[in-house]
Interface confidence: medium
Amino acid sequence: MMTGTIETTGNISAEKGGSIILQCHLSSTTAQVTQVNWEQQDQLLAICNADLGWHISPSFKDRVAPGPGLGLTLQSLTVNDTGEYFCIYHTYPDGTYTGRIFLEVLESSVAEHGARFQIP
């Protein structure tokens, strides 16, 4: 039975040209995390594999940096970066846990961080 929960940075906003950290945290399970995938809609951004470390998809190498931790840093943000981001935790023996983050990239300086929330 899957008992874990994923806590994410939730709905967040950032300024165009700036950077943002996407963070997820898996709790309430003793399952071993073997890999974390970061995806934007259907595009793979990055992989953090327990044995092999980080792989950033070639098309995002210039603007995506690994970390901190299992998180992902997006740099040089554009309005086109607005949308849903998913952290997908592959675990053993539980299986797969998915967290969702919505990022809005704003033209002005009114960007504020949203509240944290949990996805069961």
Epitope: Q32, H55, S57, T91, Y92
Partner: nanobody, 120 residues
Amino acid sequence: EVQLVESGGGLVQPGGSLRLSCAASGFTLSGNWMGWFRQAPGKEREMVAAIDWSGGSALYADSVKGRFTISADNSKNTAYLQMNSLKPEDTAVYYCAKDALSNSARFDHWGQGTLVTVSS
């Protein structure tokens, strides 16, 4: 039917080299993450290297970086692991796996493995 057949293992002295092969059938390597894993007696199976044929990206575990090289010959549908400067701690059964990074908690297809023994 998907089949993976490893070969090339054997007994080698410390500091020596071996080249492992993984002949794949039933699918094409193109578009797949292929991985080499190893399992030493009494230890968990660990991934040592993986390669993305479409992008050519290769990942290595810290313990083998600079000594092992993963490659492929798409015309032969075969993956390779060149192992140099071998150490006694490299002794293990080596396996190749298809879709190595798709979900590292569950692997659909495994070969039978090839034993590598590093000893003087």
